[in-house]
């Protein structure tokens, strides 16, 4: 950056090089150039010469004042016009940053995805700070009182092998940057209560042309957890509202769920599961599309749902879905 240049003087910032966004700041430049009594001192921000709110303090020093500085990052340097020099002489440069102190981290959540071998902890960091902000995740055993700390920039994966202090822990998050430090509330966890079963996946759908046509959705999970509760939600792609069906599931075989749907309509399905009675659900599975036939029976398999597209749904947990090749309209 600009801070690596050889200086012929000094540049400094008040109140500091990293400061709260929206503050008034002063940047000072002091020349110390051999055989040069500067006629003029100039400031540049990101290579553009600044013209206004510059005050000459004395023969070697000038001040540039910014009101309500809102840029997250800027490279500043200053130059001098020396008598008998054709070009300006570089004095010094500095990178400056503005931002906010961190908010108190909240919504601290720790889960263990089955087979991952990790405990994944996440939190809501609050508003964007614009400056380098680090998080320390504290994990304290309630049985041994031993505490471990993990430094990260966002979420953290902690190997379950490293959690040797029994099953019960306190978890909290400390956020810190150059402008401040905040600490979350403590979350109490039991390792057995935070396991999320292996992802449930819808594999195919078929509509059986009975007296009243019915659609069967086939879905499965690789989980070894015995008691699993699941939800399947579905809707016509033109609708906003989801219908939800609940299931108590044993994944020793592929699940088959029956639905009585309107003919000649495209539907979208998703499934999610949790260990029965526990706290955390899986995220909803990928969107699965099935168009019910007018009269002819039809099978839709995951293998044929190859066109990736954005769902356009306003549900936060929906990921990119797949669409049957015969229907490419947006989801309403």
């Amino acid at each position: 950056g600009i801070t690596n240049i050889n200086c012929s003087g000094h540049i400094w910032v008040e109140p500091a090089t990293i400061f709260k966004m929206g503050m008034n700041i002063s940047i000072y430049c002091q020349a110390a150039i051999k055989n040069c009594q500067p006629r003029k001192l100039h400031f540049y921000k990101n290579g553009i010469k600044e013209r206004f709110q510059i005050t000459r303090i004395n023969k070697t020093t000038a001040r540039l004042w910014y009101k309500n500085f809102l840029e997250p990052h800027a490279s500043m340097y200053c130059t001098a016009e020396c008598p008998k020099h054709f070009q300006e002489t570089l004095i010094c440069g500095k990178d400056i940053s503005s931002g906010y102190p961190p908010d108190i981290p909240d919504e601290v959540t720790c889960v263990i995805y089955e087979y991952s071998g990790n405990m994944t902890c996440t939190w809501n960091a609050g508003k964007l700070t614009y400056i380098d902000t680090k998080y320390v995740v504290h994990v304290k055993s309630l049985e041994t009182e031993e505490e471990q700390q993990y430094l990260t920039s966002s979420y953290i994966n902690i190997s379950t092998d490293s959690l040797q202090g029994g099953k019960k822990y306190l978890v909290w998050v400390q956020a810190a940057n150059a402008l401040g430090m905040e600490e979350s509330k403590q979350l109490q966890i039991h390792l057995d209560d935070i396991v999320i079963p292996s992802a449930a996946v819808i594999s195919r759908a078929e509509t059986i042309n009975a007296t009243v046509p019915k659609t069967i959705i086939y879905w499965d999970s690789q989980t070894t957890i015995e008691k699993v509760s699941c939800e399947m939600r579905y809707k016509a792609t033109t609708n906003q509202t989801w219908n939800v069906k609940e299931f108590d599931t044993n994944f020793t075989y592929v699940q088959q769920s029956e639905f009585y749907l309107e003919p000649n309509i495209k539907y979208v399905f998703q499934v999610r599961c949790q260990e029965t009675g526990k706290r955390y659900w899986q995220p909803w599975s990928s969107l699965f599309f099935h168009k019910t036939p007018e009269t002819v029976p039809q099978v839709t398999s995951k293998a044929f749902q190859h066109d990736t597209w954005n769902s356009g749904l306003t549900v936060a947990s929906i990921s990119t879905g797949h669409l049957t090749s015969d229907n490419r309209g947006d989801i309403g």
């Epitope: 006629r39 010469k49 600044e50 709110q53 510059i54």
Partner: antibody, heavy 117, light 107 residues
């Protein structure tokens, strides 16, 4: 020796366009803010357009905003002023000048623009 | 925009006299004031910057002073070549603004 040489002035009818040029030499053009300043006959000085050293930002007073456009070609050390929809009140001598935090330290000789039918 | 009020609008003085021209800014401009001389039929020339710094090649009989909102240009021992219009200009705030000018004539 510092020189700023303007060209492109003349007599023009109201509503028509004119483009002024200013060729700079003797200083580091690409480090300099540049400005067009005009002076109506017997009147004071008015800045009509300024441009940053990189050309990334421009400034105009309300009297010319939307009609005048300042631009620069640093490779050619040349400053331009495109004047559209000219009015009789735009009649003036137009000076090209280098602008810095000490003021307008270099000026061209000026070029006369007369807007009249 | 910052208003620059120059006074007097015109003045007559004799050779060898000392002349003072005033400039008042509508806000504190922190000594970011320049003075220009415009001889008849010529371009303006920078005389003084930062309220009191003499530009290269300007005779020492010219001097500037002032701070805050009040500034002045003084010409000691007036010479015939000093007959000109003098303008003040602030360049602390955007846009830069000029005073209305002071026309200096010989008595």
């Amino acid at each position: 020796e510092v020189q700023l040489v303007e060209s492109g002035g003349g007599l023009v009818q109201p509503g028509r366009s004119l483009k002024l040029s200013c060729v700079a030499s003797g200083f580091t053009f690409n480090n300099s803010w540049m400005t067009w300043i005009r002076q109506a006959p017997g009147k004071g000085l008015e800045c009509v357009a300024s441009i940053t050293n990189t050309g990334g930002s421009t400034y105009y007073p309300d009297s010319v905003k939307g009609r005048f456009t300042i631009s620069r070609d640093n490779a050619k050390s040349t400053l331009y002023l495109q004047m559209n929809s000219l009015r009789s009140e735009d009649t003036a001598t137009y000076y090209c000048s280098r602008e810095d935090n000490s003021g307008y330290d270099y000026w061209g000789q000026g070029v006369m623009v007369t807007v009249s039918s | 925009d910052i208003q620059m009020t120059q006074s007097p609008a015109s003045l007559s003085a004799s050779l060898g006299e000392t002349v003072t021209i005033e400039c008042l800014a509508s806000e504190d401009i922190y000594s970011n004031l320049a003075w220009y001389q415009q001889k008849p039929g010529k371009s303006p020339q920078l005389l003084i910057y930062y309220a009191n710094s003499l530009n290269d090649g300007v005779p020492s009989r010219f001097s500037g002073s002032g701070s805050g909102t009040q500034y002045s240009l003084k010409i000691n021992s007036l010479q015939s070549e000093d007959v000109s219009i003098y303008f003040c200009q602030q360049n602390y705030y955007s846009p830069p603004t000029f005073g209305g000018g002071t026309k200096l004539e010989l008595k």
